[in-house]
């Protein structure tokens, strides 16, 4: 059977006026997954995103991540979109450094 991913979005300061937002998916099976950043619902071009490899996490499941740099103040326009085993979810950028969003999707 399939195991849905845990999805976690974090933010960190990049350079002045910019932040790096990272979307991590973990504990999912099988390994095929779509993870991408969207702006206003439109996928960002590949050259503006960085992806991690899909790696085993030691529990028979997998993990991966995608990151991009955005302008501070524009966070509301951006979401991380995940598709896995016929299910999908959308994840906003948390409002501040201390906020992390963890969601398990079924």
């Amino acid at each position: 059977g399939s195991v849905p991913p845990m999805v976690n979005v974090t933010r960190s300061e990049a350079s002045e006026g910019n932040i790096t937002v990272t979307c991590r998916a973990s504990s999912f099976y099988p390994r095929n997954i779509t993870l991408t950043w969207r702006q206003d619902g439109v996928s960002l071009s590949h050259d503006t995103q960085q992806w991690g490899d899909v790696l085993p996490d030691g529990n028979g499941t997998y993990q991966t991540w995608v990151a991009t740099r955005i302008c501070q103040g524009e966070e509301q326009r951006f979401t991380c979109y995940m598709e896995h085993s016929g299910n999908h979810s959308t994840h906003p950028v948390p409002s501040g450094n201390s906020h992390h969003h963890h969601h398990h999707h079924h």
Epitope: D40, G41, V42, S45
Partner: antibody
Framework: EIQLVQSGAEVKKPGSSVKVSCKPS????????IYWVRQAPGQGLEWIGY????????IYNQQFKDRATLTVDKSTSTAYMELSSLRSEDTAVYYC???????????WGQGTLVTVSS | EIVLTQSPATLSLSPGERATLSCSAS???????LHWYQQKPGQAPRLLIY???NLASGIPARFSGSGSGTDFTLTISSLEPEDFAVYYC?????????FGQGTKVEIK
């Protein structure tokens, strides 16, 4: 086949409100944003706002944020745009559209003509 | 707000001729955020070209797009009867999302 079907034409009095519906089919409703755009007779296209049906986030064109209300009903996979305090200048065709993988508007509804007249 | 100015407002040409439509932006736009739409009378717009130069699904190869920065172009290499319509450019780089005022391609 992806389709967005909108509600029928409306005639409204100045000062009243109108609510236009948009029912997409052919894809997972919550996977794409729904945009709203209007076009006055013989004029160009004007973006009103969009809603993310999955998380319910709404982004408005500031020009419309005081009068437009975007909502979705996930149980019926339907999006709505309500415009209040109507005036004659709001006479237009109102379109819903779906956000695409690579562009803001990849599929469009057929449009709903809203006529504001006393 | 990024203002998109399309020129000319009307283009009068005959079938078989080449059409060149311009879209000028008030601020620089990444090529990823400039799109073109076609609209025929009584119909909704339809996506023609996305991200400056990519043909949308089902759009014939006589359509092409180019440009960068503030100047973008839509070209129809040889006009077919069904190409006579209004064409809009649109930017998605900054809010509010905006459209050009349109160029009408009419039969001469």
């Amino acid at each position: 086949e992806i389709q967005l079907v909108q509600s029928g034409a409306e005639v409204k009095k100045p000062g009243s409100s109108v609510k236009v519906s948009c029912k997409p089919s052919g894809y997972a409703f919550t996977s794409n944003n729904i945009y709203w755009v209007r076009q006055a007779p013989g004029q160009g296209l004007e973006w009103i706002g969009y809603i993310d049906p999955y998380i319910g986030r709404i982004i408005y064109n500031q020009q419309f944020k005081d009068r437009a209300t975007l909502t979705v009903d996930k149980s019926t996979s339907t999006a709505y745009m309500e415009l209040s305090s109507l005036r004659s200048e709001d006479t237009a065709v109102y379109y819903c559209s779906r956000s695409g993988e690579r562009s803001n508007f990849d599929y469009w509804g057929q449009g709903t003509l809203v006529t504001v007249s006393s | 707000e990024i203002v998109l100015t399309q020129s000319p407002a009307t283009l009068s040409l005959s079938p078989g001729e080449r059409a060149t439509l311009s879209c000028s932006a008030s601020s620089s736009i990444s090529s990823n955020y400039l799109h073109w739409y076609q609209q025929k009378p009584g119909q909704a717009p339809r996506l023609l070209i996305y991200r400056t130069s990519n043909l949308a699904s089902g759009i014939p190869a006589r359509f092409s797009g180019s440009g960068s920065g503030t100047d973008f172009t839509l070209t129809i290499s040889s006009l077919e009867p069904e190409d006579f319509a209004v064409y809009y450019c649109q930017q998605g780089g900054s809010l509010p999302l905006t459209f050009g005022q349109g160029t009408k391609v009419e039969i001469k």
